[in-house]
Interface confidence: low
């Protein structure tokens, strides 16, 4: 007679279990277990009992113990039930904003989870249960319909799964979806009222007012005031179900001509819009264009100045020839040009008035490296035991790396205060290196010994 212990097990997916196979005869010809699971036999004394560790149990399984005794062969099964919580509990995506009076369908999808007989899906508004159904199908799907009301505004809807293993001596496992927060709204069919000047001059300010009644919730209404592509920044005053948005509009040269003034009220996924035209005249700042803002020494650089077609420009004080909206100059970049500003001034006559605009750009010149006598003297003579600071400055853009070595190894401590010793004497090769190249210079240090009478 073959027996198995335990005869019934519930375990988490991927878990392990010890199964004991026993037989009633003392000397069985055969005693073992039949299972597709990974198994490991534990060594025990005696022949009529074997213990196996079955591991990585991913699904329900029925391992079978068997034995062969003199009085015949027999088997016994153990029933392994795997449990696991769902891998996905999700409310189908919905627009967060819903108009009052609309029917809203909530759909919850549940993937995985076992045993399904113990798995329930619950749809909730806050903590209030709207629907409870067993999980059926893969994925399991539970739906319910809600009529959107004003007082639903801000309510959280969610979906919860309950894997109830309390009858099996375990606990209640709950998984909850990310909440869906419902925002309800009312946007009236009437467009907003827009009051603004019809004509605006560049560099002056006008006031624009946009208002609308009958909104819910008014505090959530977004007001977009725009002149052409330029968004205005209004100050919004709210009433119980109304708002008034007031903005100062400063127009730029980009807005010249006939522009569209827009007031759009967005609430939820709906909007109401009012359009008006505003006529603007302007004059943009000139544009300074360098062929390259960063060049190596000796490179030819073209500097162009371009302005409004009716403007007259000067570039670094030199008027365009002939007088007009464009000027350019050509230069060969020198180290002295590094950081040089190129300034373009444009003048435009608008209604008999002269308007001036400026624009400046800077040129960066890469040069060097340089080592010269002024900043890196070739000869130093110092008394022995005196305190000295060897100075050698390399110039260039980018700033070069400088090393001074005697015999290729002994460094001269540039910029550091040192006590002069005999070791310091000798000729050093100073090498300045940057991405622009490298230069070398010999520096000789002479040490004067003190005389003793």
């Amino acid at each position: 007679q073959t027996s198995v212990s335990p005869s019934k097990v519930i375990l988490p997916r991927g878990g392990s279990v010890l199964v004991t196979c026993s037989t009633s005869c003392d000397q069985p010809k055969l005693l073992g277990i039949e299972t597709p699971l990974p198994k490991k036999e534990l060594l025990l004394p005696g022949n009529n009992r074997k213990v196996y560790e079955l591991s990585n149990v991913q699904e329900d399984s029925q391992p079978m113990c068997y034995s062969n005794c003199p009085d015949g062969q027999s088997t016994a099964k153990t029933f392994l039930t795997v449990y696991w919580t769902p891998e996905r509990v999700e409310l189908a995506p919905l627009p967060s904003w819903q108009p009052v009076g609309k029917n809203l369908t909530l759909r919850c999808q549940v993937e995985g989870g076992a045993p399904r007989a113990n798995l329930t899906v619950v749809l909730l508004r806050g903590e209030k249960e709207l629907k409870r159904e067993p999980a059926v199908g893969e994925p399991a799907e539970v739906t319910t319909t809600v009529l959107v009301r004003r007082d639903h505004h801000g309510a959280n809807f969610s979906c919860r799964t309950e894997l109830d293993l309390r009858p099996q001596g375990l606990e209640l496992f709950e998984n909850t979806s990310a909440p869906y927060q419902l925002q309800t709204f009312v946007l009236p069919a009437t467009p907003p009222q827009l009051v603004s000047p019809r004509v605006l001059e560049v560099d002056t300010q006008g006031t624009v007012v946009c208002s609308l009644d009958g909104l819910f919730p008014v505090s959530e209404a977004q007001v977009h005031l725009a002149l052409g592509d330029q968004r205005l920044n209004p100050t919004v005053t709210y009433g119980n179900d109304s708002f008034s948005a007031k903005a100062s509009v400063s127009v730029t040269a980009e807005d010249e001509g006939t522009q569209r003034l827009t007031c759009a009220v967005i609430l939820g996924n709906q909007s109401q819009e009012t359009l008006q035209t505003v006529t603007i005249y302007s004059f943009p700042a000139p544009n300074v264009i360098l062929t390259k803002p960063e060049v190596s020494e000796g490179t030819e650089v073209t500097v162009k100045c371009e302005a409004h077609p009716r403007a007259k420009v000067t570039l670094n004080g030199v008027p365009a020839q002939p007088l007009g909206p464009r000027a350019q100059l050509l230069l060969k970049a020198t180290p002295e040009d590094n950081g040089r500003s190129f300034s373009c001034s444009a003048t435009l006559e608008v209604a008999g008035q002269l308007i001036h605009k400026n624009q400046t750009r800077e040129l960066r010149v890469l040069y060097g490296p340089r080592l010269d006598e002024r900043d890196c003297p070739g000869n130093w003579t110092w008394p022995e035991n005196s305190q000295q600071t060897p100075m050698c400055q390399a110039w260039g853009n980018p700033l070069p790396e400088l090393k001074c070595l005697k015999d290729g190894t002994f460094p001269l401590p540039i910029g550091e205060s040192v006590t002069v010793t005999r070791d310091l004497e000798g000729t050093y090769l100073c090498r300045a290196r940057s991405t622009q190249g490298e230069v070398t210079r010999k520096v000789t240090v002479n040490v004067l010994s003190p005389r003793y009478e």
Partner: nanobody, 128 residues
Framework: QVQLQESGGGLVQPGGSLRLSCAAS????????MYWVRQAPGKGLEWVSG????????YYADSVKGRFTISRDGSKKMVYLQMDSLKPEDTAVYFC?????????????????????WGQGTLVTVSS
């Protein structure tokens, strides 16, 4: 006189956070896009982030997306860069800048540096 002044840099451990600020003056702040760029030691300029004149549209380089947040405060004339989950490769001098030409103020995307008005920069060092 246009002026941009950055602050908020410093030494921070990997995974830490910093908030950079840029104070702007000398121009109509609400009309212009603002940007942050950075220059790592020995490297060229790298465009980091941009924000439109109204603060509604923001742009980020792929290297900082999801970690950095650009914002602006029109009343204070300030631009901010909130830097979270910092990495050693974020070590750089961070510059604030503004495009000064009028027709750049409303374009729908970030123009490349260099630009017209720059701050002095603030150093951010990410190291353990």
């Amino acid at each position: 006189q246009v002026q941009l002044q950055e602050s908020g840099g410093g030494l921070v451990q990997p995974g830490g956070s910093l908030r950079l600020s840029c104070a702007a003056s000398g121009f109509t702040f609400s009309n212009y896009w603002m940007y942050w760029v950075r220059q790592a030691p020995g490297k060229g300029l790298e465009w980091v982030s941009g924000i439109d004149h109204g603060g509604d549209s923001t742009y980020y380089a792929d290297s900082v997306k999801g970690r950095f947040t650009i914002s602006r405060d029109g009343s204070k004339k300030m631009v901010y860069l909130q830097m979270d989950s910092l990495k050693p490769e974020d070590t750089a001098v961070y510059f604030c800048y503004v495009q000064a030409a009028a027709w750049w103020s409303l374009v729908g995307g970030p123009p490349p540096p260099p630009s017209d008005y720059w701050g002095q920069g603030t150093l951010v060092t990410v190291s353990s």
